[in-house]
Amino acid sequence: LEVQVPEDPVVALVGTDATLCCSFSPEPGFSLAQLNLIWQLTDTKQLVHSFAEGQDQGSAYANRTALFPDLLAQGNASLRLQRVRVADEGSFTCFVSIRDFGSAAVSLQVAAPYSKPSMTLEPNKDLRPGDTVTITCSSYRGYPEAEVFWQDGQGVPLTGNVTTSQMANEQGLFDVHSVLRVVLGANGTYSCLVRNPVLQQDAHGSVTITGQPMTFP
């Protein structure tokens, strides 16, 4: 029995619902009484949801899963996962048994956009050319880990003296703090970009130092 799932991972935003697609081709005369369907976590074999003896056996996964009962007879064995969490990320296997047996695994990639970075400066007053300053770029509650880039006011990458840390909160979402140490010129703009590699979402912030006062666009 051929079971079909998407090749590419299913990308779902934290807090939204995701559909893990799975389909099979029922033969003529097929009835739901013949169908055994099991969704499980590929790695741990933990049961997620099942259908047997013509009946939906319900969710074994935090009561956040559902099948599409009206579509099962047409060979649609897809699973709906509600209120996606970071912990849901991984591979799910769809097992289908009628007379024959088949299975396929689909990957769930969880994502959350990063907030617009906030920029802080230390020290933040009485700055003169030649002073060393620390610029911190902070962005919150994203997933997965971000890529962080710095540029000067002419678009030239700044790669030296950059330290980036990423800490996961209790929901598994990351807070990013990237610190750039620079020696000030006469004036200058410093920009930080936080990129979510899954969503290909960019969030950026910048600080312009022009003696006094400083501006935070």
Epitope: D152, Q154, G155, V156
Partner: antibody, heavy 121, light 106 residues
Framework: EVQLQQSGPELVRPGVSVKISCKGS????????MHWVKQSHAKSLEWIGV????????YYNLKFKGKATMTVDKSSSTAYMELARLTSEDSAIYYC??????????????WGAGTTVTVSS | DIVMTQSPVIMSASPGEKVTMTCSAS?????MHWYQQKSSTSPKLWIY???KLASGVPGRFSGTGSGKSHSLTISSMEAEDVATYYC?????????FGSGTKLEIK
Amino acid sequence: EVQLQQSGPELVRPGVSVKISCKGSGYTFTDYSMHWVKQSHAKSLEWIGVINTSSGNTYYNLKFKGKATMTVDKSSSTAYMELARLTSEDSAIYYCSKYYGSSFHWYFDVWGAGTTVTVSS
Amino acid sequence: DIVMTQSPVIMSASPGEKVTMTCSASSSVSYMHWYQQKSSTSPKLWIYDTSKLASGVPGRFSGTGSGKSHSLTISSMEAEDVATYYCFQGSGYPLTFGSGTKLEIK
């Protein structure tokens, strides 16, 4: 009118170095970075690197690190690129180009006429 | 590195014909920019920020796209459009160009 005036063609022997120049006019030279781009028949357009014309900060394409060195003379509004240990693979047209934009949103708005470098014994 | 793939490599169009060329990026880009290069001259900015025409570019040119897939269209081919067109991304270093689409006239 914004212009980038590049130095003339160079015919050089393998193994030596060459330094080509790009003089900016019609704008505040130290407000915009200068990039260098190589064009050869084999590889189309290849980005070599960039220099901040105010601070002198540089960033190179890894492929050209050790091959190209970029400098700037603010007093004459001129950017330079030196190419070292030349081989026939370095024979190409080299363009300087001015980068325009802000905060991770940039493009080349003006190009020089190009400097042809021919490496031949 | 973000790899830019342009297609077709060479194309030929009759005067008045609609022309479309594409540029596919290996990763999503915020904006695509296009340059026109005529033989023995330097490239010229032609379309920037995906869809904005540079100064002096005729209105028959347009650019569209998002993410990984972008295109340049000429609504009605003219003889002066014969050139090579390069796409370019400034979203990530190293900066990269497509290998170009050479446009000829029939």
